[in-house]
């Protein structure tokens, strides 16, 4: 058993049928010695008397808010949560496996640049009685500071019969140098509590591996005289690290017909312009990627050919 | 501690092309190592990230773009002095700081070259003959060093009398390649910045 926060405790259980559970001793936070009784949640049934209460915690029915009273007055509370260990592995019931980029990916994180700011998000089908708390650091043995905000509900989607909820959090490394070569990964730890179930999820990454630039901005077409060709131009996104000559991007320019089946023409360039043939009803899209370290491509920025 | 804006003209910067070749070569070599050594811990998540140049060179600091010198977090106290007569400095306006930057890159390349050659000698003794260093990568390191053209003491190749532990050597190869790829990215960024300035 360990303390998650004041008056909230996590009991770790080896979770299998007929498991013996864990013996837990609760102590009433009071100078009083006599006439103390204990109850669980809203029940008025007295579980025991005295300054301490010993319980055998086996299942969720044994978890909850234990309260000690004296003469009708509440003295203190202890909330017991359960953390299930199923055959050597901590349970992952609360969050959905996003399966990208690999199985058992519960937290996904992205950064728009090298400033040390990043966003993580996760999915659940649970809509109520759910709380998250996020901590982060650079490295784990001698951790350096990363500050995270509060996790917020960022999207709701319908997936078949189920509703899916996306939560996200923004974090910022306290002293980040965009040009630094990372040798210690960023660690992100999410505590999740659903009713009386506690779970924790972690992700470890280098900022360089989670870079996904914003799409190029100011995408424009300039028709070339007496030609079906157009000059496409764009700019680096505002959110990208500067100077751009040091943090350079490479670009992919795509001409896509109206129908998805039509052949796509693609050009790769390090410049911020390209000459392409504009077909009728086609659209031109441009996306960006770090020129020197192949992390994710940005989303597409698009303009119609007409 | 930083790169000045007054640097060589774009057409006068022969190192850019070599640094791009270097990044391509080390990336290909790392990919090959990850595929060949699939039963060894060779992914970024599995290896310890070690920098063999730590406390010996200060490339990131010496080559910091002027725009980032206002960032407190980028100003590291490590100071290293270097020789300053490289041929990539194709302009008389080249400052001392830029020379320091390029000589730091040269020292990095020299250290990695020695490590890779020593490692290759061990790998050639492996009866499994599982993996060797790409000669193209070694050649590209050499080309960039020649383009930088710094006079510096030659570091003798390390020779070891004891029987090599091939498992450990292959893991060290992975660690070295990951670190060298990161340094090659920094070198490419620096060359691109100098070329544009």
């Amino acid at each position: 058993i360990w303390e998650l926060k004041k008056d909230v405790y996590v009991v770790e259980l080896d979770w299998y049928p007929d498991a013996p559970g864990e013996m837990v001793v609760l102590t009433c936070d009071t100078p009083e010695e006599d006439g103390i009784t204990w109850t669980l949640d809203q029940s008025s049934e007295v579980l025991g008397s005295g300054k301490t209460l010993t319980i055998q915690v086996k299942e969720f029915g044994d978890a909850g808010q234990y309260t000690c009273h004296k003469g009708g007055e509440v003295l203190s509370h202890s909330l017991l949560l359960l953390h299930k260990k199923e055959d050597g592995i901590w349970s992952t019931d609360i969050l959905k496996d996003q399966k990208e980029p690999k199985n058992k990916t519960f937290l996904r994180c992205e950064a728009k640049n090298y400033s040390g700011r990043f966003t993580c998000w996760w999915l659940t089908t649970i809509s109520t009685d759910l709380t998250f708390s996020v901590k982060s650091s650079r490295g784990s043995s001698d951790p350096q500071g990363v500050t995270c905000g509060a996790a917020t509900l960022s999207a709701e989607r319908v997936r078949g019969d189920n509703k899916e909820y996306e939560y996200s959090v923004e974090c910022q490394e306290d002293s980040a140098c965009p040009a630094a070569e990372e040798s210690l990964p960023i660690e992100v730890m999410v505590d999740a509590v659903h009713k009386l179930k506690y779970e924790n999820y972690t992700s470890s990454f280098f900022i360089r591996d989670i870079i996904k630039p914003d799409p190029p901005k100011n995408l424009q077409l300039k028709p070339l005289k007496n030609s079906r060709q157009v000059e496409v131009s764009w700019e680096y996104p505002d959110t990208w690290s500067t100077p751009h000559s040091y943090f350079s991007l490479t670009f992919c320019v795509q001409v896509q017909g109206k129908s998805k089946r039509e052949k796509k023409d693609r050009v790769f360039t390090d410049k911020t312009s390209a000459t392409v043939i504009c077909r009728k009803n086609a659209s031109i899209s441009v996306r960006a990627q770090d020129r020197y370290y192949s992390s994710s491509w940005s989303e597409w920025a698009s303009v119609p050919c007409s | 501690r930083n790169l000045p804006v007054a640097t060589p003209d774009p057409g006068m910067f022969p190192c850019l092309h070599h640094s791009q070749n270097l990044l391509r070569a080390v990336s290909n070599m790392l990919q090959k190592a990850r595929q060949t050594l699939e039963f060894y811990p060779c992914t970024s998540e599995e290896i310890d990230h070690e920098d063999i140049t730590k406390d010996k060179t200060s490339t990131v600091e010496a080559c910091l773009p002027l725009e980032l010198t206002k960032n407190e977090s980028c100003l590291n106290s490590r100071e290293t002095s270097f020789i300053t007569n490289g041929s990539c400095l194709a302009s008389r306006k080249t400052s001392f700081m830029m020379a320091l930057c390029l000589s730091s890159i040269y020292e990095d390349l020299k250290m990695y070259q020695v490590e890779f050659k020593t490692m290759n000698a061990k790998l050639l003794m492996d009866p499994k003959r599982q993996i060797f260093l790409d000669q193209n990568m070694l050649a590209v390191i050499d080309e960039l060093m020649q383009a930088l053209n710094f006079n510096s003491e030659t570091v003798p190749q390390k020779s070891s009398l004891e029987e090599p532990d091939f498992y450990k050597t292959k893991i060290k190869l992975c660690i070295l390649l990951h670190a060298f790829r990161i340094r090659a990215v920094t070198i490419d960024r620096v060359m691109s910045y100098l070329n544009a300035s």
Partner: antibody, heavy 115, light 112 residues
């Protein structure tokens, strides 16, 4: 006393279907994940499928994906394996088993796929 | 399709120590826990070892398990006639959990 009692096995022709049941007692069935494991005559153990405690997630071996469906009825304390498009290589003793560091197995039920 | 490899058979005389190996990889035994089962003819498997080296109550202390790197082993110190059975190791793969990975199985024969 934890008990898993299996039923539903038998002889079936290739291409046909069969449903196995596993009735649980002596524990809170709705709190635990469950597996199906099979063993062909004279062969080793092969994992078939897994279902989470609440039925929210199901996992299958590649050899049965798309043909077998694992399900549970927590109100009846029963685990099921619906087997469709049966093949000769599905002939085996099928076991249900609880998930956890200490596990409990059913007695096994024989499924024979033969024309 | 078995990724956990065991010797097909091992044998020993009563009182001898016999060991069964179970060889896997970094993504299974290398990063997950191992169990060992005993299966007597015509019966369901019985758990002998969980969590690499833990013995459930009721299992004789002559059975012990260990794990090192990507391999695990089961030792029977002072093998007895009633130990003649098939033995299976079981682990998970970190990418496909909770799918069970079973070893190929080892037939233990007690001679004499």
């Amino acid at each position: 006393q934890v008990q898993l009692v299996q039923s539903g096995g038998g002889v079936v022709q290739p291409g046909r279907s069969l449903r196995l049941s596993c009735a649980a007692s002596g524990f809170t069935f709705s709190s635990y994940g469950m597996h199906w494991v099979r063993q062909a005559p004279g062969k080793g153990l092969e994992w078939v499928a897994f279902i989470r405690y609440d039925g929210s997630n199901k996992y299958y071996a590649d050899s049965v994906k798309g043909r077998f469906t694992i399900s549970r009825d927590n109100s009846k304390n029963t685990l099921y394996l619906q087997m469709k498009s049966l093949r000769a290589e599905d002939t085996a003793v099928y076991y249900c088993k609880t998930h956890g560091s200490h596990d409990n197995w059913g007695q096994g039920t024989m499924v024979t796929v033969s024309s | 399709s078995y990724v956990l490899t065991q010797p097909p058979s091992v044998s020993g005389t009563p009182g001898q120590r016999v060991t069964i190996s179970c060889s896997g990889g970094r993504s299974n035994i290398g990063s997950e826990t191992v169990k060992w089962y005993q299966q007597l003819p015509g019966t369901a498997p019985k758990l002998l070892i969980y969590g690499n080296d833990q013995r459930p109550s009721g299992v004789p202390d002559r059975f012990s398990g260990s794990k090192s790197g990507t391999s695990a082993s089961l030792a029977i110190t002072g093998v007895q006639a009633e130990d003649e059975a098939d033995y299976y190791c079981q682990s998970y793969d970190r990418g496909t959990h909770p799918a069970l990975l079973f070893g190929t199985g080892t037939k233990v024969t007690v001679l004499g």
